[in-house]
């Protein structure tokens, strides 16, 4: 376990920092200059630093389950769970699902009444008794209802010519009803005669384009539970069609731009506002069906099976069955689909804030296990054979008290999960003894909480009317800086620097801005290691015999000595046994200066006074020319020829000596003086 903590000054802040963090409430656990944050660390670290086990605060996430034995048949247990969540630490609990035999079923038959479904309608009219009989084989309480759909009644979905709106069928002799979006024909009932009678009254209709408005109809079936008559039981929606479906965006073709609002808009059992709202998106419909526990069974003809299989990948708890061209196999299809649906169990939860994460481990009866999935999933679930899901809930921060619901999709049972924060430390501060805080505060988890007007580790500092901002101002370099560089406590306007966990690191300075390790390194060690130098506030101070910014050099000048054993020829300094030459002089020994201006003009007056005791420096020659020494013998060096103060040409040679502006000068005996005009 790790404990990565940022500015932590209380037990609660510590617990919020992560699941590996624990808090030591021991009195005087911190030494002078220690920040309160050192109380917050991993359990092994605190134990190692002398905090007794019973002084360590480490609240853990936990789950409490409550069974509710009242009420009817329950397929999910427990019914209620209370979780206490510490940030970053999961609380786990088990949910058991036991599939009940003979669970009540509501089946709503939603049928496409476009013209191509003519023969299907004939068969469905005779179906009522068969359907109920089939349901009664599965359950003691089955009910059936009926609805139908065509499409939106605007171009290009239907032909809007008045004659075609009256009778959309291609065969004029055929009695046909005007097109409509969705009609709720029969509320859910256990009366098969009523089904036969109401469905028997239905007439085929027609539309223009191939896809139908089936999603519009499904949305209304899901959004209008009272009108449809859904009970709180297994809800099946049989969707029978021989063609595809329009979805969100298609409405634009008919200038319908308002998105589907997912609400019930039935008036006189008709979806009369279908031309105002676009078709729903598949995701929107999937959400609405799941929210209302409705399991769709797509009964579609062979050419449409692939299309609707794709749809079932998006809509959870849905199935596809191949419908014969005349719907004669629909009862068999529904039985198969129901068995398939009821033997697959999905455990899911309602939408949660980002601060809560839920995962499921599914332990299915056939030995299959799925771990850390976003929802529970078991297939091949047998009647009365329990299966277990382990639910893990994690909070990313200290959450508000809240609840959410876990349900098995398609079933009405729910598990209510109440979530509470586990962020408080129940510290056993022996008493409200104020003496430990200089009588100016009380103890909370080992830390003094000071009265107003007092601050400091033991409330020892009186603010004396100065605001905490003023006091803190003395502990900042400037307004943009952090108090004590973030490395100390501001106590009475002075920084008390923290002790560091890093070996060899000492923090100091007015604003705790200095330390003993943040210096240049050499050979991977600060200041070349303790044998070469030490680090003081970002700068290496080298031991005798070493130099350089990281004490990387031995203090020797051998490489800087010219043939006369003068360091850098007196025109530079020796650093790390290499010359650093003054401006213009060249390495290695600062002997030459190719770019320097000629010294000839500078020294003509010195040549004149040294040799001939004439010129402006005549009376003060040695003081005016301190760096020059007259030679009686010719020298090697720069040859000069300059006019003296009397206009005569003087020839002389300058040989540079070690040091700056130091020359040996040899001046020719004779001057060339040109006679002026008479």
């Amino acid at each position: 376990q790790e404990c990565t903590k940022f500015k932590v000054s209380s037990c609660r802040e510590c617990i919020e920092s992560g699941p590996g963090c624990t808090w030591c409430q021991k009195l005087n656990f911190t030494g002078p200059g220690d920040p309160d944050s050192i109380r917050c660390d991993t359990r092994p670290q605190l134990l190692m630093r002398g905090c007794a086990a019973d002084d360590i605060m480490d609240p853990t996430s936990l789950a409490e389950t409550q069974e509710d034995h009242n009420g009817g048949q329950k397929q999910l247990s427990p019914q209620k769970v209370t979780l206490y969540l510490r940030p970053g630490q999961a609380a786990a609990f088990n949910v058991t699902f036991r599939r009940a035999k003979g669970y009540p079923i509501d089946l709503y038959y939603l049928m496409d009444l476009s013209y191509s479904m003519l023969d299907d309608l004939r068969n469905v009219k005779k179906l009522g008794g068969d359907l109920l009989r089939a349901l009664n084989e599965i359950t003691e309480s089955g009910r059936i209802g009926f609805g139908s759909f065509v499409d939106k009644t605007v171009l290009p979905f239907v032909n809007t010519h008045p004659d075609k709106l009256r009778n959309p069928c291609p065969n004029k002799e055929k009695e046909c009803q005007p097109p409509f979006a969705f009609r709720h024909v029969l509320k859910l009932t256990n009366n098969s005669n009523q089904f036969q009678t109401e469905v028997g009254k239905q007439l085929i209709s027609g539309n223009l384009d191939a896809p139908e408005g089936g999603l519009d109809a499904m949305m209304q079936v899901a959004a209008c539970p009272e009108e449809i008559g859904w009970r709180n039981v297994t809800r099946l929606l049989v969707f029978a069609t021989d063609d595809g479906f329009h979805f969100a965006g298609d409405g634009k073709l008919g200038a319908i731009l308002t998105p589907n609002d997912g609400r019930c808009h039935l008036e006189d059992n008709l979806y009369k506002r279908s031309n105002e709202f676009d078709y729903p998106s598949v995701g929107q419909l999937a959400h609405k069906l799941a929210e209302n526990n409705i399991q769709p069974i797509f009964a579609v003809t062979s050419r449409m099976v692939k299309t609707y299989e794709k749809l079932t990948e998006i809509i959870p708890k849905s199935a596809v069955g191949e419908l014969s061209e005349d719907s004669s196999n629909v009862v068999h299809l529904i039985k198969n689909a129901y068995n398939k649906l009821s033997s697959r169990v999905f455990l899911d939860h309602n939408a949660l804030p980002d601060t809560l994460k839920v995962t499921y481990d599914s332990f299915c009866s056939n030995g299959v296990t799925h771990r850390n999935q976003p929802r529970g999933d078991c297939d091949g679930v047998q009647i009365n054979v329990p299966i277990t899901f382990q639910v893990k809930v994690t909070a990313t921060e200290c959450i508000q008290e809240q609840s959410f619901v876990i349900r098995a999709l398609g079933f009405t049972d729910i598990v209510t999960v109440q979530v509470l924060p586990q962020c408080e430390c129940r510290c056993r501060d022996q008493s409200r003894d104020r003496s430990l805080c200089h009588g100016k505060g009380f103890l909370e988890c080992g830390i003094c909480r000071c009265d107003t007007g007092y601050i400091g580790k033991n409330c020892e500092c009186q603010t004396q009317g100065r605001s905490s901002q003023e006091l803190e101002g003395s502990c900042r370099k400037d307004n943009n800086s952090i108090i004590c560089s973030g490395l100390g406590d501001c106590v009475c306007g002075q920084c008390l620097c923290h002790t560091s966990d890093v070996p060899g690191k000492l923090i100091y300075g007015q604003y705790c801005e200095c330390d003993t390790i943040n210096c240049e390194r050499y050979n991977g060690q600060v200041c070349g290691g303790p044998g070469r130098g030490l680090c003081f506030c970002g700068k290496c101070r080298c031991h005798p015999g070493f130099e350089g910014s990281a004490c990387q050099c031995e203090r020797t000048t051998e490489g800087c000595l010219n043939p006369r054993r003068v360091e850098c020829s007196g025109r530079g300094r020796c650093r790390c046994n290499v010359c650093e030459c003054h401006s213009g002089y060249q390495l290695p020994l600062c002997q030459e200066c190719p770019g320097c201006p000629s010294p000839c003009g500078k020294y003509i007056s010195c040549a004149e006074c040294l040799k001939f005791e004439k010129g402006p420096f005549g009376k003060n020659c040695s003081a005016a020319c301190p760096g020059l020494q007259l030679s009686n013998n010719p020298v090697k060096g720069r040859t000069c020829k300059e006019r003296d103060s009397e206009g005569c040409w003087v020839a002389y040679t300058l040989e540079q000596q070690d040091g700056m502006d130091r020359y040996l000068i040899y001046v020719d005996e004779s001057r060339e003086c040109v006679a002026g005009p008479n």
Epitope: G509, Q510, Y511, E513, C537
Partner: nanobody, 112 residues
Framework: EVQLVESGGGLVQPGGSLRLSCAAS????????VDWYRQAPGKGREWVAI????GTTNSRDSRFTISRDNAKNIVYLQMNSLEPEDTAVYYC?????????WGQGTQVTVSS
């Protein structure tokens, strides 16, 4: 305002010793690094010794020892076996609150 005052300089014979002092207002010297530098005639300033608030010390030459008296708020530089090359003005310097402060210096002359 931070003020540093050096004292203890003077004329000493080669091989002799001197103890220089650096005093400051407040308790600053006990809370930051204190350096001694020196500047010989015609040369640049060169570092001599340092002491940190927690007592760690270092010097460029083993003849020089730096120490502190926190009660008096003074830092000392003990110089032994002095040589003529040690002739210079000796300065104490601190880095405090993002600024560098220098004293006015004390002259040390080593001559026979």
């Amino acid at each position: 305002e931070v003020q540093l005052v050096e004292s203890g300089g003077g004329l000493v014979q080669p091989g002799g010793s001197l103890r220089l002092s650096c005093a400051a207002s407040g308790s600053i010297l006990s809370r930051t690094d204190v350096d001694w530098y020196r500047q010989a005639p015609g040369k640049g300033r060169e570092w001599v010794a340092i002491i940190a608030p927690f007592g760690t010390t270092n010097s460029r030459d083993s003849r020089f020892t730096i120490s502190r008296d926190n009660a008096k708020n003074i830092v000392y530089l003990q110089m032994n076996s002095l040589e003529p090359e040690d002739t210079a003005v000796y300065y104490c310097r601190i880095y405090w609150g993002g600024n560098v402060y220098w004293g006015q210096g004390t002259q040390v002359t080593v001559s026979s």
